[in-house]
């Protein structure tokens, strides 16, 4: 039960006090007791419940006519059952007794009022009055947890605006309101109560720039909203009429959880006694609601696809046709960024990551815009953000970034359980160097901090700086599977490729050509690839790098070898010993449900079929997956990327609610 104030009674004159329903009010009957008195009794109106405890050990007894010793060990508490119809209509009488004196009486006139701040602390999507029974001042995780949730109002419901909704002090319309969380103030008081009392709604100064609160004012024609709390206003005096009254507030978060902001925001209502104009206002009662800002959540390849994004660039019509066909098969919407908007930047995966935010009453896709800021710089903010599609970015917007800050270097695993610890929303994966050095690359700290601060998809740092481009999507992918954990981890594997080529040579196919049919590209015989000592050494190094990640992923995602599929792939070391795919990197694939868009490897054709394609199909088709090999050689591969790098996908949010997990 909520804590009320302490009331001191004195025999000299009647005491007037306010008691808020649902609170426990302490009664100090000792400090002003007549000197010769040694005991007391209490009588109260029917609407007041008095508890007397004499401890230790506490013997509790409800009031009657019995007397109690007058000593500091006696605790007297009051609660009220009903709100008062008029000021001071509930009475408590304390009688003091002494051996030689007649009883001395002290009178207390109580006004019972109902004041409660309610939000959706049960996470049902509805605001139910709590009558302060539940402690709203704490926020707890898990299926039995409680606490309200706020969304960062980061979409743009007004198409004529260039800013996010949370960047203005206005409520555009009912669409805008739906992105906010409802909070209701319920009051029941005597009619004249607010002539001597005031309610103030407030937020801590440290949190005022993270939240905005609008008050709904019901006019004759429509309801209007005006801002009452926010970055410029930490408190607001409320004009509340006496009697029974409900006031609605709409709350929006302005910031995502981050290093300097754990994501919790407390809104408090304070009841102030303003009866004595010559004295400062005194706090009578406070009620608070704690909100947690919904985290930004990534979706893994195992979530159903809803929309595919790609770029139109010079001569990639065939690539786009293949992606269009794949999207149609997967029943996905397709969005193409035209040449004039992408400014010859085709790397859609690197520019953004599409996740979502969720409250019990609303789910919103949110695009995380990377700070790489190349030709596609404007695409997320101009073409993706919009009504019910939010936007967030982090990191320096001008310089100070590396290739590892592109979001081909940001992936998320499907849900996993690791040594008994559940990650029902999976774990974020990003690439890093294996140790810091003068020229090593890492994802910008601001991005790492943001990802960690979301709490629900605890990040795993992988080693990717060995690659020229340096992205995790160059050596790993996830595909859905009908068995085991519901997915397989795909890893690029030079060892598996050498094994395949060796088998082909053993069967007399050593003259078969890699890159056959590609104009202007020097073709390579299987036997030459197998006999090239330098290429072997390079791939031995690459294998060690991938194996390091393999063990890391097994440990951090709780995987067994049978959860991993090796995809045959060769690499070559380029300048500064950085690796690039030797032929189109098949693991860099587009996953749309059971439809896979895989870079066409142009492997040696044996018995009319590319042996690399055949091998990959034999590994993935038993899982119910359909492989489509897409020619990206001249438009993507030779520019250091593949199908996954050149596409992006919005996926269905998890059915699991993030607040039901325990981070």
């Amino acid at each position: 039960m909520a804590q009320g104030t302490l009331i001191r009674v004195t025999p000299e004159q009647p005491t007037h006090a306010v008691c808020v329903l649902g609170t426990l009010t302490q009664l100090d009957i000792c400090s002003s007791a007549p000197e010769d008195c040694t005991s007391f009794s209490i009588n109260a109106s029917p609407g007041v419940v008095v508890d007397i405890a004499h401890g230790p050990p506490a013997k509790k007894k409800s009031t009657g006519s019995s007397t109690w010793p007058l000593d500091p060990g006696v605790e007297v508490t009051l609660t009220m059952k009903v709100a008062s119809g008029s000021t001071g209509d509930q009475k408590v009488q304390i009688s003091y007794y002494g051996p030689k004196t007649p009883p001395v009486k002290a009178l207390l006139y109580l006004t019972g009022v109902e004041i409660s701040l309610c939000a959706d602390i049960t996470r049902t999507g509805k605001v139910k009055p709590t009558r302060a029974v539940k402690d709203q001042r704490t926020w707890t995780w898990g299926p039995c947890g409680q606490g309200a949730i706020l969304l960062v109002n980061c979409d743009r419901d007004n198409l004529e605006s260039s800013a996010m909704d949370c960047e203005d002090d206005e409520v555009l319309d009912s669409e805008d309101l739906q992105d906010m969380s409802l909070m209701t103030l319920s009051t029941k008081t005597p009619k004249d109560f607010f002539t001597n009392h005031t309610l103030v709604l407030h937020v801590a100064r440290s949190e005022m720039d993270k939240v905005r609160v609008f008050q709904a004012t019901r006019g004759k024609l429509s309801s209007k909203c005006s801002v009452v709390l926010g970055p410029k206003w930490p408190s607001h005096y409320l004009m509340v009429p006496g009697g029974k009254h409900n006031m609605d507030f709409y709350v929006e978060a302005l910031a995502f959880p981050d290093t300097d902001f754990p994501g919790l925001i407390t809104l408090t209502i304070s009841l102030l006694d303003t009866s004595n104009l010559e004295l400062p206002e005194a706090v009578v009662f406070q009620d608070s609601v704690v909100f947690r800002v919904a985290p930004w959540i990534m979706t893994p390849n195992t979530q159903p696809p809803q929309e595919v994004y790609a770029c139109s660039i010079f001569e990639n019509e065939d690539f786009l046709k293949s992606v269009t066909t794949l999207a149609m098969k997967a029943k996905c919407k397709l969005t193409i960024c035209p040449e004039e908007e992408n400014m010859d930047d085709q790397w859609m995966q690197d520019e953004m990551e599409i996740g979502y935010i969720q409250a019990p009453h609303k789910t919103l896709p949110v695009v995380f815009d990377s700070p790489r800021n190349r030709g596609l710089k404007e695409f997320p903010i101009k073409r993706v953000m919009g009504p019910d599609f939010g936007y967030v970015t982090r990191g320096p917007q001008t310089g100070g970034i590396s290739g590892l800050d592109s979001f081909g270097n940001l992936e998320v695993s499907p849900p996993v359980t690791v040594r008994g610890k559940e990650y029902p929303l999976g774990r974020i994966l990003f690439g890093d160097s294996c140790y810091p050095s003068n020229d090593s690359r890492q994802m910008h700290q601001a991005l790492q901090d943001f990802l960690s601060a979301q709490q629900v998809q605890a990040p795993v740092k992988l080693y990717s700086d060995w690659l020229s481009v340096g992205h995790v999507d160059e050596f790993l992918s996830f595909v859905p599977a009908p068995d085991r954990k519901g997915f397989r981890l795909l890893l690029a594997s030079p060892r598996s490729c050498y094994k395949l080529f060796q088998e082909q040579q053993n069967e007399g196919h050593g003259e078969a050509l890699l890159f056959e049919g590609i104009k202007k590209k020097k073709q390579q015989k299987i036997k030459n690839i197998l006999s090239n000592k330098t290429l072997r050494e390079h791939n031995s190094f690459v294998e060690r790098c991938i194996d390091w990640n393999r063990e890391l992923l097994k440990r951090e995602l709780g995987l067994a070898e049978s959860d991993i599929i090796d995809i045959p792939q060769l690499f070559k070391l380029k300048e500064f010993s950085k690796a690039e795919a030797f032929f189109p990197n098949m693991v860099n694939m587009l996953v749309l449900g059971k439809h896979l868009g895989i870079p066409k490897p142009f492997g040696p054709v044996i018995n009319g079929r590319c042996c690399l394609e055949e091998k990959v199909c034999s590994l993935l088709e038993p899982l119910g997956l359909q492989c489509t090999f897409i020619n990206d050689f001249f438009t993507y591969h030779i520019r250091h990327g593949e199908v996954h790098c050149g596409t992006n996908v919005r996926r269905k949010p998890f059915s699991f609610k993030w607040w039901n997990m325990v981070p």
């Epitope: 190349r374 590396s402 290739g403 050095s437 003068n438 020229d439 690359r441 020229s468 481009v469 340096g470 590209k521 020097k522 390579q524 030459n528 690839i529 090239n532 330098t534 290429l535 390079h538 070559k572 070391l573 380029k574 300048e575 500064f576 010993s577 950085k578 030797f582 030779i638 520019r639 250091h640």
Partner: antibody, heavy 128, light 111 residues
């Protein structure tokens, strides 16, 4: 064959900044590794910085690391060297140089370590 | 002081051969086959004449040849001609924190 032209040099006070540009013509610079090399008056060549063709990694000489930043804008067919906290010892002719990354051999690293195309250079003088 | 050591000057008569040495360490010249040589005439930009120890770019006469033994690389110019008079610089990839090193340069005089 690509041709390179440097610009942006000039006189600057110690502690000041300059931004050098290297503009390419005759070919697409995105197919090339690019390095900046400098030569102090009457002295030898000193390698300064490197950027990969894919714009994915960069390297610096110890003498400039933390003060200089190399970047590229493939859409503008240009590479830049942002020079901050300049010192008297940074006075030199700055050359932009490149090597083609379009190699067909099975393995052919090394093209980022030599420079087969050079610009004419731009003079940077740091003096109070 | 340069990281790779070259003689300050060499000279030879037309038609003769000269060799310019470039000494590094086991962390640069000795470790990598990424040694290159540049020719620079006064007031001009350098020009690549040898890369990957011994390879010649197209257009460079075969009078120029490169080799390497241990931590020392060498540039040999046979059949010296007057237009060969210039400064010559060697360069190597390095394991050090500065990944490309140059020699201090050698002035070749054709007598």
């Amino acid at each position: 064959q690509v041709q390179l032209v440097e610009s942006g040099g000039g006189l600057v006070k110690p502690g000041g900044s300059l931004r050098l540009s290297c503009a390419a013509s005759g070919s697409t610079l995105s197919d090339y590794f690019v390095s900046w090399i400098r030569q102090a008056p009457g002295k030898g060549l000193e390698w300064v910085s490197f950027i990969s063709s894919a714009n994915t990694f960069t390297y610096y000489a110890d003498s400039v690391r933390g003060r200089f930043t190399i970047s590229r804008d493939n859409a503008k067919n240009s590479v830049y060297l942002q020079m901050n906290s300049l010192r008297a010892e940074d006075t030199a002719v700055y050359y932009c140089s490149s090597a083609n990354d379009d190699v067909d051999d099975i393995v052919a690293p090394g093209r980022g370590y030599y420079m087969d195309v050079w610009g004419r250079g731009t003079l940077v003088t740091v003096s109070s | 002081q340069s990281a790779l050591t070259q003689p300050r000057s060499v000279s030879g008569s037309p038609g003769q051969s000269v060799t310019i040495s470039c000494t590094g360490t086991s962390g640069d010249v000795g470790r990598y086959n990424h040694v290159s040589w540049y020719q620079q005439h006064p007031g001009k930009a350098p020009k690549l004449i040898i890369y990957n120890v011994y390879e010649r770019p197209s257009g460079v006469p075969d009078r120029f040849s490169g080799s390497k033994s241990g931590n020392t690389a060498s540039l040999t110019i046979s059949g010296l001609q007057a237009e060969d008079e210039a400064d010559y610089y060697c360069s190597s990839h390095s394991r050090s924190s500065t990944p490309v090193l140059f020699g201090g340069g050698t002035k070749l005089t054709v007598l």
